[in-house]
């Protein structure tokens, strides 16, 4: 229904404190780097002029769209210009082509400093304060590195911080309560970042139709007693909401996934049995909860798939009389069937049937062509499988450590054009799926896989677009979603490729790395060796090894020497020329 | 919506001939197969013959070999079926369909061979 005033009607959905932190949301994701009091200031000017709005609805402006309404804003801002370069040039159209330009400007890699933690006594401090600066703070930091993040599962992540922070702030020993509690909601928060980069780039790509599938698919594995009526209701509202959020639309695309949750809950009976304990929690909780929600026992009489999409006669006349529909359904029905599938390979034998009945169909006696389709799936899924299996026994023979080091091995051979540190930050990430997927029960390990390298390759296409330099990247970020994983993992050592000469510098330490944290250790080690690889590609599994025991030992020895400093000076030279010996 | 609609049968005598024709509207028509369908009074569909999106692959039931030919004009979006030296056994309703299905969704058209 039409309203007066939007920006009125979302303030009175949404209440003051979510529409707050939205505005605060939305603001930060487009302008990355004004500061959080830059955009505290513009949060209550837009919130006041809201409540002016409530009051009357008539009063002026109050009928603009909010598009208009918050680019005004982000255009008034002084020294846009300077700041922000030709983002500026976007204050010169019109909506909807400002909003548009807006958010094409959106950089998912800002050049801003790691968010830091502060220690515990600090941060409870500040929280004590004032918690809701406190939490505007975390809204601004993690939105303006995350410009896709999902704006209302942001504010539930606030909310989780924010009960942290209450408990661990009132026991003796805050920092032990704390640290391992943050960084689970970190993980969790930094998952979330590149699962909806995902949603939002196949939707930017590919359209809705391409998000919608992957709803049905997602939908229909988890609730294979909902029939495709209403399994196609939720796929439609759930892509308004990504679609919404994705577009920068973030007030509607926050109540609008509430009105799914109330739907959702209203509806159980036809959707889930295993809804309610999500719905009987407040919202913020609810929805996300219903966004994990464990799959519901599959029918136990389903008939096999082969009858209505093979066996059939009327196959090609179903499938010519409503295209959409009739994949539609083969997706539904063939998703609800296995929760052991990843939604990328069930999107990829729904193209493959597709394919099929294209070719088929226009013989003259389809039947006989389609008949074997189900048979031509083997191959498909065969394909992942071994994929998990093989990963999953590295990573259980290596620990997560020594799995991102052969994962980093593996991609710097196949594009070692593409950056150090994309390279070294996609290992790390791609070698978590072991700690994450591997230690689940094994029909819950290659939908866990599959799709989320799926989101982390994502992100390198989406880094590697902004500079491309590999012809190998290029070629499986261009193709569709749902084929880039099983690219990646064809490619092999770019033959293509001069190797880098060797510079002593690049693998010379100093004794600082000795006080760096576990992790940031990690990282200058596996910096060294992608700049090795890079240096030797066809160095042998057991070379590498060899170079990076030694490169192990020595930081070990001169970290516990008692002159650092000297250590590092005298051993370094020697460990140079060890590495360059030991890969000749 | 798809819409097949056949025309061009009658009453004919034994050794004569009949040209039907089926047009289809509501799907790309060029991207299917096309069968003709018979069905005799009192009896089930019986499939006489089918052809390619693109034309170029026929297929004929053993009783109509020789003496029916189906043909498409894919710019008309219009399915045809010769049928020359008609049999009495050939009387039947006459309906187009769409890939392999045996199943009516149209009106079809009747043709009577009887002298």
């Known amino acids: 229904e039409a309203h007066k005033s939007e920006i009125a009607h979302r303030y009175n959905d949404l209440g003051e404190q979510h529409f707050k932190g939205l505005v605060l949301i939305a603001f930060s994701q487009y302008l990355q780097k004004c500061s959080y009091d830059e955009h505290a200031k513009l949060v209550q000017e837009v919130t006041d002029f809201a409540k002016t709005c409530v009051a009357d609805e008539s009063a002026a402006n109050c009928d603009k769209s909010l598009h208009t309404l918050f680019g005004d804003k982000l255009c008034a801002i002084p020294n846009l210009r300077e700041n922000y370069g030709e983002l500026a040039d976007c204050c010169t159209k019109q909506e909807p082509e400002r909003n548009e330009c807006f958010l094409q400007h959106k950089d998912d890699n800002p050049s801003l400093p790691p968010f830091e933690r502060p220690e515990a006594e600090a941060m409870c401090t500040s929280f004590k304060e004032n918690p809701t600066t406190f939490m505007g703070h975390y809204l601004h930091e993690v939105a303006r590195r995350h410009p896709y993040f999902y704006a209302p599962e942001l504010l539930y992540y606030a909310e989780q911080y924010n009960e942290i922070l209450t408990q661990c702030c009132a026991e003796a020993d805050k920092e032990s309560c704390l640290t391992p509690k943050l960084d689970g909601v970190k993980e969790k928060a930094l998952v979330s970042s590149v699962r909806q980069r995902m949603k939002c780039s196949s939707m930017q790509k590919f359209g809705e139709r391409a998000f919608k599938a992957w709803a049905v698919a997602r939908l229909s594995q988890t609730f294979p007693n909902a029939d495709f009526a209403e399994i196609t209701k939720l796929a439609t509202d759930l892509t308004k909401v990504n679609k919404e959020c994705c577009h920068g639309d973030l007030l509607e695309c926050a109540d609008d996934r509430a009105e799914l949750a109330k739907y959702m809950c209203e509806n159980q009976a036809t959707i889930s049995s295993k809804l309610q304990t999500c719905c009987d929690k407040p919202l913020l909780k609810k929805a996300h909860c219903l966004s994990e929600v464990e799959h519901d026992t599959m029918p136990a009489d389903l008939p096999a798939i082969a009858a209505d999409f093979v066996e059939d006669q009327e196959v090609c006349k179903n499938y010519a009389e409503a295209k959409d529909v009739f994949l539609g359904t083969f997706l539904y029905e063939y998703s609800r069937r296995h929760p052991d599938y990843s939604v990328s390979l069930l999107l990829r034998l729904a193209k493959k049937y597709e394919a099929t009945l294209e070719k088929c169909c226009a013989e003259a006696n389809p039947p006989a062509c389609y008949g074997t389709v189900l048979a031509e799936f083997q191959p498909l899924v065969e394909e992942p499988k071994n994929l998990v299996k093989t990963n999953c026994d590295l990573y259980e023979k290596l620990g997560e450590y020594g799995f991102q080091n052969a994962i980093l091995v593996r991609y710097t051979q196949k594009a070692p054009q593409v950056s150090t540190p994309t390279l070294v930050e996609a290992a790390r990430n791609l070698g978590r799926v072991g700690t994450k997927c591997c230690t689940l029960p094994e029909d819950q390990r290659l939908p866990c896989v599959e799709d989320y390298l799926s989101a982390i390759l994502n992100r390198v296409c989406l880094l590697h677009e902004k500079t491309p330099v590999s012809e190998h990247v290029t070629k499986c970020c261009s193709g569709s979603l749902v084929e880039r994983r099983p690219c990646f993992s064809a490619l092999t050592v770019d033959e293509t490729y001069v190797p880098k000469e060797f510079k002593a510098e690049t693998f010379t330490f100093h004794s600082d790395i000795c006080t760096l944290p576990e992790k940031e250790k990690q990282i200058k080690k596996q910096t060294a060796l992608a700049e090795l690889v890079k240096h030797k590609p066809k160095a042998t599994a057991e070379q590498l090894k060899t170079v990076m025991d030694d490169f192990a030992q020595f930081l070990d020895t001169c970290c516990k020497a008692a002159d650092k400093d000297t250590c590092f000076s005298t051993e370094g030279p020697n460990l140079v020329t060890r590495c360059k010996d030991a890969l000749a | 919506k798809v819409q097949l609609v056949e025309s061009g049968g009658g009453l004919v005598q034994p050794g004569n001939s009949l040209r039907l024709s089926c047009a289809a509207s509501?799907?790309?028509?060029?991207?299917?197969?096309m069968s003709w369908v018979r069905q005799a009074p009192g009896k089930g569909p019986e499939w006489v013959s089918s052809?390619?999106?693109?034309?170029?692959?026929?297929l004929y039931a053993d009783s109509v070999k020789g003496r029916f030919t189906i043909s498409r004009d894919n710019s008309k979006n219009t399915l045809y079926l010769q049928m020359n030296s008609l049999r009495p056994e050939d009387t039947a309703v006459y309906y187009c369909?769409?890939?392999?299905?045996?199943?009516?969704s149209s009106q079809g058209t009747l043709v009577t061979v009887s002298s």
């Open positions: 052809i390619s999106g693109s034309g170029s692959d026929t």
């Open positions: 509501g799907f790309t028509f060029g991207s299917f197969g």
């Open positions: 369909t769409i890939g392999g299905s045996l199943s009516r």
